[in-house]
């Protein structure tokens, strides 16, 4: 007996799609071996039509795919635009066609619906609108027009031209009588329900000369589109429900038991707690379409998702819907990285962000998720030398360590920095990851003075005290700018006296600026690292002023000014509206920026659900107010 299992008989109609799931024992060999779908010939051979190695027969070009789900031990063959020629005997299998690891499937495609026995067949998706056309003769032009539904043996009146509407159809049905020239009336039913399906009879007149027309209404539940994404990665659901629901509240829900569908997010501001920090509902276009992005995919996110439109912002009978079956691949290409990073107030965090290593030249971004409205993620920094103005001097995106990981360092932490941040690039949109920064109680490990004032032409020495716990780390000083932090020479001054209970392994490392110039003004960081992996940092702002008295300045911890909590913009600084230039590869579904370099004092857009927002100035233009 073959261990492969699937449907033995599949019956469908012309023009339809089928989705055939084949089950196999999920051994490691089976998971990774070739999967195929072949058609059995009269002489016993089996001709491959599609395989997991990328082969697609010309007969299936543009209308079929094969997707392997290794952690489930299944693969799925989708075939669209069926014709009667597709009827026949097939095999789904593993390995080589002629070997025994296969399962026989019979596919029968019958003629599509049409005018059968003078019955017009209407096939319409759930939640959509149907118009049933009913012709009549001149003698019945002035007579009552009606539509009945066959319930069991009896016809039940649905609507008539005298104003009656069956309660099951209230608010979603109308009867239109065409102008005098056309001998036709039509019944329009909106927000179709599954229960609306059945046999209808329309009638003009009530006597033996009445005109009658039969209609068969078939209401289809949308077949779920199969979506297969990696654990820890990202998924985007594109939902296009049509312009007729452009002004109706939209939702994405996840089916739980039975027909229950728990709202994940909707345009009325509801969001499921499990998706906090990792979901965005992107704005609707004029045609009513929208998209939902979920990052940091978890095993438990797998399931059936529906998007729809209803004034309640949740699934109701008659909601037009689209469906997806999300599978989360646990054999993920996206490496594990911490989902929570903790930092002490006043200190720093270094966040490692994974990206697709095949896209090392892609632009890297870091944004702060905001939960207001439908969620948005304003960009804070990118790898092209842009930093949001409020983050000058305390945020840096480094390409290190490279080879699939970049680093974001944020220092001078305050409680306001707690929240969810997204790592992303303008390349593979599946590699969007989420990290939560939590601010915890404690003291920063590195001790530096607060703001420091240097005198033009003189020498300035700035100390940084490293506790013994960092004895094995490389210690450095660097000057921050919007492209990173350029390393500077520093001097090891021996053990530090700044720590209680810390032995000779503590260190005082000083930065010396000789013959200070105006160009020396700015932010300086001292920090620790191991190879290309960064640890804690501390920041000092050095202001430069005119000479008052001769001599060099040697700054101690006690003499330093207190660092201001936040920089403010010069009064002359102009925040302009975000005119986001859309790079089609940079989240086609999100309003994000590709490049704003040409905009004077330009602001940066966000991965966003709003329209133009003021995001604060770009740090390409240095404005300090001390």
């Amino acid at each position: 007996k073959s261990p492969i299992f699937g449907p033995e008989e599949v019956n469908s109609v012309e023009g339809n799609s089928v989705s055939i799931t084949c089950y196999y024992p999920p051994t490691s060999v089976n998971r990774h071996t070739r999967k195929y779908w072949c058609r059995q010939g009269a002489r016993g051979g089996c001709i491959t039509l599609i395989s997991s190695e990328g082969y697609v027969s010309s007969k299936y070009a543009g209308r079929a795919n094969l997707t392997n789900f290794p952690e489930n031990g299944t693969f799925v063959v989708n075939i669209a635009q069926l014709s009667q020629d597709d009827s026949g005997r097939y095999k789904c299998g593993l390995g080589i066609n002629s070997r025994g690891l296969s399962f026989d499937v019979s596919l029968e495609v019958s003629q599509g619906p049409g005018l059968l026995n003078d019955t017009k067949v209407y096939t319409v998706d759930l939640g959509r609108t149907v118009t049933i056309n009913c012709p009549f003769k001149t003698e019945n032009a002035q007579k009552r027009k009606s539509l009945y539904k066959q319930i069991g043996l009896y016809p039940v009146l649905v609507i008539d031209s005298s104003g009656y509407v069956n309660p099951n159809y209230t608010g979603r049905i109308r009867l239109d009588i065409q102008g005098t020239g056309q001998l036709l009336f039509s019944v329009v039913i909106n927000q179709l329900r599954l229960s609306d399906a059945g046999q209808y009879l329309c009638q003009a007149g009530d006597d033996s000369n009445s005109n009658k027309k039969n209609a068969d209404l078939q209401v289809l539940k949308p077949e779920p589109e199969l979506v297969y994404e990696d654990l820890r990665g990202s998924v985007t659901f594109h939902c296009a429900l049509g312009p007729e629901v452009a002004n109706v509240a939209k939702f994405l829900c996840r089916q739980s038991s039975g027909e229950n569908c728990d709202v994940v997010v909707n345009t009325l501001g509801k969001r499921a707690p499990a998706f906090e920090g990792r979901i965005l509902l992107n704005p609707q276009d004029k045609d009513g379409s929208f998209s939902v992005v979920i990052t940091g995919l978890r095993k438990e996110d797998a399931g059936r998702y529906l998007c729809g439109a209803h004034s309640d912002g949740q699934l109701q009978e008659g909601s037009p819907i689209q469906a997806w079956q999300l599978f989360v691949n646990e054999e993920s290409t996206i490496p594990r990285s911490p989902t929570v990073v903790k930092g002490v107030a006043g200190s720093s965090v270094a966040v490692l962000c994974p990206y697709n290593r095949k896209e090392s030249k892609s632009i890297k971004y870091w944004c702060l998720w905001e939960g207001a409205q439908n969620g948005r993620c304003p960009l804070l920094v990118d790898s092209e030398g842009w930093v949001k103005a409020q983050y000058e001097g305390r945020l840096s995106l480094l390409e290190e360590p490279g080879n699939g990981t970049f680093t974001v360092i944020l220092n001078q932490l305050t409680s306001r920095d707690a929240g969810f941040y997204w790592c992303l690039t303008n390349g593979d949109t599946l590699w969007r990851t989420t990290v939560e920064i939590k601010i915890i109680e404690g003291e920063p490990n590195l001790k530096v003075p607060g703001n420091v004032t240097a005198v033009l032409g003189e020498t300035l020495k700035v100390p940084c005290h490293f506790p013994c716990k960092f004895s094995s780390y490389e210690k450095y000083w660097c000057k921050w700018n919007n492209t990173g932090c350029q390393a500077l020479p520093s001097q090891d001054e021996g053990p530090s006296k700044a720590f209680v209970n810390c032995d000779e392994n503590s260190r005082l490392v000083s930065l010396t600026l000789n013959l200070v110039t105006r160009a020396d003004e700015g932010w300086y960081w001292c920090g620790v690292k191991q190879g290309h992996f960064y640890g804690e940092t501390a920041a000092v702002y050095v202001a430069v002023e005119e000479r008052k008295a001769a001599g060099s300045r040697d700054v101690s911890l006690a003499k330093a000014d207190a660092a201001p909590d936040e920089k403010v913009l010069d009064s002359g600084f102009r925040e302009i509206e975000n005119k986001a230039i859309q790079d089609p590869r940079l989240f086609a579904e999100e309003k994000a920026v590709a490049d704003t370099r040409d905009q004077a004092d330009g602001s940066r857009a966000s991965v966003d659900s709003g329209s133009s927002e003021e995001q604060g100035g770009s740090s390409r233009h240095h404005h300090h107010h001390h």
């Epitope: 449907p7 109609v13 799609s17 289809l220 077949e223 089916q255 039975g258």
Partner: nanobody, 127 residues
Framework: EVQLVESGGGLVQPGGSLRLSCVAS????????MAWFAQAPGKEREFVAA??????????YYSDSVKGRFTVSGDNAKRTLDLQMKDLNPEDTALYFC??????????????????WGQGTQVTVSS
């Protein structure tokens, strides 16, 4: 309230035939999968056959032990499921349960992938 009611069970001689029927009432939405499971005394429920509907497409599944002998059929609109059983043998003796699920998720052979169950109808094959 969802109710699944089976009928058609009985005593039959080896080699004989039976037709089981199941009617589901109150099933939410458009039920996407219905199945037959058999439970012999002292044994676990075992998959027999299933039919799944997605739109205007139906998918029929059978266990190896009944292939070629049993035929599953049904009507999604009427919420009915039938099992035509031929060439019955004593190993087919069991309580036959009808099961239903409102979508077509998961392996149809696994009983845990069905939300609604009937009370069962007894089939005894004996001379």
């Amino acid at each position: 309230e969802v109710q699944l009611v089976e009928s058609g069970g009985g005593l039959v001689q080896p080699g004989g035939s039976l037709r089981l029927s199941c009617v589901a009432s109150g099933l939410p939405g458009s039920s996407s999968r219905m199945a037959w499971f058999a439970q012999a005394p002292g044994k676990e429920r075992e998959f027999v056959a299933a039919i799944a509907w997605r739109g205007r497409t139906s998918y029929k599944y059978y266990s190896d032990s009944v292939k070629g002998r049993f035929t599953v059929s049904g009507d999604n609109a009427k919420r009915t499921l039938d099992l035509q059983m031929k060439d019955l043998n004593p190993e087919d003796t069991a309580l036959y349960f009808c099961a239903a699920h409102p979508n077509d998720d998961g392996d149809p052979r696994i009983s845990g992938n069905y939300q609604y169950w009937g009370q069962g109808t007894q089939v005894t094959v004996s001379s």
